[in-house]
């Protein structure tokens, strides 16, 4: 919806030294980077699907919404958006689908108004622990970020470093306690097998947490107690088998929460009894009447809300002497 006011660079490509100097001087009022569209009225710059390999240096100082989607940025270095004067108005930055595989420490420094950051659909093999905090201090200056969108940032298996992807992401979220003000965190579609137990305790301002379309099997060691004002917890399309009493009690104790649990392979055996009882009583689960059993085979597609204790049995474990091969 933003209309281009100028899509020609103020500097010709035959004078690259000038282009690099532009970050140290005020951009011209009507300047718009090459291959971008700018609307001063909407405070918006769009450099979309242009195969850019680096962030344009000559971004207009008025920019509040910056779209750099569908490019080939590969690496986001420290101070990638640092300018003189700084981009003091930049509030929303979308870098999704730009083939980023490395985000370095301090990549988003000198953006004092940055509230929304979207790095989705980038194969982030190397996300610095200090990508968002900017420094390796044990307590960093608070980040202004309120929304952090990190959906589908898992790199292909063969491009992953020799470390836990979950651990790498969590280290970046927790470094320097910089993201204490974060209200929305989206981590959907990242093949997460587990959620490190310390991550939620250190993000007390979270209102919306999206963990959908991962591979979470259990929430046994995850505590939601600190997320006192959590409003939405998206756990659809995971590998959850059952929610245990501790988790159920914590969720019930959060007065503003809505929980989304569709499309999990619920195991309807004796361990499911507490969850079924809770589901029948609670109002916090959205679409709870759609939840169905996946296992055991005899229970497949049964609606959880329609089960009673007699339906939920566990086959007795035979002593070794009675087991057959």
């Amino acid at each position: 919806s933003s209309s281009p006011t100028s899509s020609a660079s103020s500097f010709s490509s035959s004078a690259p030294f000038l282009a690099s100097a532009v970050s140290a001087q005020p951009p011209l009022p009507d300047q718009c980077p090459a291959l971008c569209e700018c609307s001063e009225a909407a405070r918006t710059v769009k450099c979309v699907n242009r195969n850019l390999t680096e962030v344009p240096t000559d971004l207009p100082a008025y920019v509040r919404n910056l779209f750099l989607t569908g490019n080939q940025l590969a690496v986001l270095p420290a101070g990638a958006f640092a300018r003189r004067p700084p981009l003091a108005e930049l509030a929303a930055l979308n870098l999704s689908g730009s083939r980023l595989d490395e985000v370095r420490a301090g990549a988003f420094e000198h953006l004092p108004s940055l509230r929304q950051l979207d790095l989705s659909h980038n194969p982030l093999a190397d996300l610095s622990p200090f990508a968002f905090s900017g420094s390796n201090a044990s307590v960093s200056a608070p980040s202004p970020l309120v929304e952090l969108i990190l959906n589908h940032i898992v790199p292909p298996e063969d491009e992953r470093q020799n470390r836990s992807f979950e651990g790498m992401v969590v280290a970046a979220l927790l470094a320097g306690r910089a993201l204490q003000g974060l209200r929305r965190l989206e981590l959907a579609s990242n093949h997460f097998l587990y959620l490190p137990r310390d991550v939620l305790a250190q993000l007390p301002s979270l209102r919306h947490l999206d963990l959908s379309n991962n591979s979470l099997v259990s929430l046994t060691y995850v505590s939601f107690r600190n997320l006192t004002h959590l409003e939405s917890l998206h756990l659809e399309d995971n590998a959850l088998k059952v929610l245990h009493n501790g988790t159920l009690a914590e969720l019930q104790g959060l007065p503003h929460i809505r929980v989304f649990l569709d499309n999990n392979p619920w195991v309807c055996d004796c361990h499911m009894a507490d969850m079924v009882t809770w589901l029948k009583e609670t109002e916090v689960v959205q679409g709870k009447d759609r939840l169905t059993c996946a296992y055991p085979e005899k229970m497949r597609n049964r609606v959880l809300l329609e089960l009673n204790s007699a339906d939920l049995d566990c086959d007795p474990i035979l002593p070794p002497s009675l087991q057959t091969s």
């Epitope: 929303a92 509230r115 929304q116 309120v146 929304e147 209200r183 929305r184 209102r207 919306h208 006192t228 004002h229 409003e231 939405s232 104790g253 007065p255 503003h256 809505r258 109002e283 959205q286 679409g287």
Partner: antibody, heavy 115, light 107 residues
């Protein structure tokens, strides 16, 4: 910052219904919960209910059950509160308040019920 | 419903004074206690949520404390612009309920 702008003052007869609207902007960081609170002249605050705008789930104060209906239109980021079978003691300023802890409030809509 | 009893109902203090308001819930509300400021003819504003967390943009002279059923709101140094009515509110157990309000005036 979240801004909430409510519809204008209304004068209604007893037995009639009133529908108040609340338009949210600065929406990106707003809450999914929209609460409705009323305040009779010179009195305190009374919570009427809330709606979760993403799925339309509502919680109502039992005092108003059967008389109040809360709805939301996500496409235009607007919430509505309709109160039916109005009585003279429903005369009050009606506020929408966004957030679990009622973080941001609209400017209020005066509803006067008088024959 | 949870009853919220606020005291005093009104108070008069000088600029620079420390002002304290208390709120008692009829049952444990697990720290889900908020404080609102309302100036005449205006909508309420959230100052403090979850007992002691300052809402964005609220001056640090406002603070809150407490647990269980007993909660306290403090203005460390009263300013002329703090003249208003202050309400406590519970958002732990539906329906949410409010205290009756404390009107703060300047001596």
């Amino acid at each position: 910052q979240v801004q909430l702008v409510q519809s204008g003052a209304e004068v209604k007869k007893p037995g009639a219904s009133v529908k108040v609207s609340c338009k949210a902007s600065g929406y990106a960081f707003s809450s999914s919960w929209m609460n409705w609170v009323r305040q009779a002249p010179g009195q305190g605050l009374e919570w009427m209910g809330r709606i979760y705008r993403e799925d339309g789930h509502t919680n109502y104060n039992g005092k108003f059950k059967g008389r109040v209906t809360m709805t939301a239109d996500k496409s235009i980021t607007t919430a509505y509160m309709e109160l039916s079978r109005l009585r003279s003691d429903d005369t009050a300023v009606y506020y929408c308040a966004n957030g679990g802890a009622m973080d941001y409030w609209g400017q209020g809509t005066l509803v006067t019920v008088s024959s | 419903d949870i009853q919220m009893t606020q005291s005093p109902s009104s108070l008069s203090a000088s600029v620079g004074d420390r002002v304290t308001i208390t709120c008692r819930a009829s049952q444990d509300i697990s720290n889900y206690l908020n404080w609102y400021q309302q100036k005449p003819g205006k909508a309420p504003k959230l100052l403090i949520y979850y007992t002691s967390r300052l809402h964005s943009g609220v001056p640090s002279r406002f603070s809150g404390s407490g647990s269980g059923t007993d909660y306290t709101f403090t203005i460390s140094s009263l300013q002329p612009e703090d003249i208003a009515t202050y309400f406590c509110g519970n958002d732990n157990t539906l329906p949410w309920t409010f205290g009756g309000g404390t009107k703060v005036e300047i001596k």
